[in-house]
């Protein structure tokens, strides 16, 4: 079928392939220090690493992309490592009317795949 | 707010930033010639191009990623160009019981963004 099994073992060696990694960032780093009050420091999970052939393919399109990249590397880019899902985070921030809590559903990655 | 407006004009020049591009592929290219009967050739829309700062940001996570990449380029990768939506395609293929039509919802990209 079109859905060849995506590979889950990294052929490039430990930590080289697409995975979730925690990055510490301050509100200053993000340019949010004037409107976000808390948390002052965020633990941001991000997707990093390479996407070798069929590794954690997001879908059929990603599998095709991987194959065509092998045939036409100048024309078709390799799949790249992006979030497959997110974990919500609540931020406390300034508003015109004072201070409020707001949930961000798309801020911190929870899983990664190659798309 | 966290949702800074994503940029829609490409600062790198025409055709350089993340966009949809048509790639011709035969069933042989895809390794599907033994089970897909039609079409013999596919027009595959793919997402190609670079993702400069805040260009077509998929969401808040992508905006953060762009910013942190500017601060820590060795640790945080730049956002990359991936499908934001797909257009379904029908393939005619062989099955154990003969020939059937099957819809693939995730085969051809319809839109792109930077994630």
């Amino acid at each position: 079928s079109a859905h060849a099994h995506p590979r889950d073992s990294c052929p490039l060696g430990p930590g080289r392939c697409c995975h979730l990694e925690t990055v510490q960032a301050t509100l200053e780093d993000l340019g949010w220090s004037d409107w976000v009050l808390s948390p002052r420091q965020l633990q941001l999970s991000m997707c990093v690493g390479e996407c070798p052939h069929l590794y954690r393919s997001a879908n059929t399109h990603a599998q095709i992309k991987a194959r065509l990249h092998g045939l036409q590397p100048d024309k078709v880019p390799a799949p790249c490592c992006v979030p497959s899902s997110y974990t919500p985070v609540v931020l406390m921030h300034r508003t015109d009317s004072g201070v409020s809590l707001q949930t961000y559903d798309d801020l911190v990655a929870r899983g990664c795949h190659c798309a | 707010s966290a949702h800074a407006h994503p940029r829609d004009s490409c600062p790198l020049g025409p055709g350089r930033c993340c966009h949809l591009e048509t790639v011709q592929a035969t069933l042989e290219d895809l390794g599907w010639s033994d089970w897909v009967l039609s079409p013999r050739q596919l027009q595959l829309s793919m997402c190609v191009g670079e993702c400069p700062h805040l260009y077509r940001s998929a969401n808040t996570h992508a905006q953060i990623k762009a910013r942190l990449h500017g601060l820590q380029p060795d640790k945080v990768p730049a956002p990359c160009c991936v499908p934001s939506s797909y257009t379904p395609v029908v393939l005619m293929h062989r099955t154990d019981s003969g020939v059937s039509l099957q819809t693939y919802d995730d085969l051809v990209a319809r839109g792109c963004h930077c994630a």
């Epitope: 002052r40 809590l101 949930t103 | -």
Partner: antibody, heavy 120, light 107 residues
């Protein structure tokens, strides 16, 4: 370890003002905000308000608006809660509670509590 | 304001029992629910945050679940030190609001 130590019990007359202090130790004081919660005798928990120890921004419960003021002194890592025009139904144990490092709107740890008795 | 309704208001149980406490929010709060334990004369102690995350140092017999409006705190095997009052608290919007509490008593 992280600790919040509150000032001692107070007895006040109706109409008076009380100021409760909460001294923090074991962490960077201005990195995490502080809420105040009270509990009337035999009753549940009532959130009073929040102060950002970093910026001084505050948000107060509607029913206490105009009577309560929350402040901080970063030089001594102390948060204060002042309640004015006291009434008998303000008799309660008052707690300071820091925002949790894991989730800004969860509270951990809590101070030991300060009993404020309003009686004529 | 978001109202938090806790049930039951009290429960009698024996050591070793499995105890379940529920909390319902008057509107969706995503997963922003915390659970606290309070013993007589003491300050509340955080057990669970973000609906299901166990606070550091809290025994694994405590667990939380749910999202949106319906949440549950479960004590898988009640220990003598678990007899206390338990409160839920929503953290999705100001004002922060607490449930009315559930007193877990010895049967």
């Amino acid at each position: 370890q992280v600790q919040l130590v509150q000032s001692g019990a107070e007895v006040k007359k109706p109409g008076a003002t009380v100021k409760v202090s909460c001294k923090a130790s074991g962490y960077t004081f201005d990195s995490l905000g502080m809420s105040w919660v009270r509990q009337a005798p035999g009753q549940g928990l009532e959130w009073m308000g929040y102060i950002s120890t970093y910026s001084g921004d505050t948000v107060y419960a509607q029913k206490l608006q105009g009577r309560v003021t929350m402040t901080t002194d970063t030089s001594t890592s102390t948060a204060y809660m002042e309640l004015r025009s006291l009434r008998s139904d303000d008799t309660a144990v008052y707690y300071c509670a820091r925002e949790s490092g894991q989730q800004v709107s969860a509270l951990d740890p809590w101070g030991q509590g300060t009993l404020v008795t309003v009686s004529s | 304001d978001i109202q938090m309704t806790q049930s039951p208001s009290s429960v009698s149980a024996s050591v070793g029992d499995r105890v379940t406490i529920t909390c319902r929010a008057s509107q969706g709060i995503s997963r922003w629910l915390a659970w606290y334990q309070q013993k007589p004369g003491k300050a509340p102690k955080l057990l669970i945050y973000a609906a299901s995350s166990l606070q550091s140092g809290v025994p694994s017999r405590f667990s939380g679940s749910g999202s949106g409006t319906d949440f549950t705190l479960t004590i898988s095997s009640l220990q003598p030190e678990d007899f206390a009052t338990y409160y839920c608290q929503q953290g999705a919007s100001f004002p922060l609001t607490f449930g009315g509490g559930t007193k877990v008593e010895i049967k």
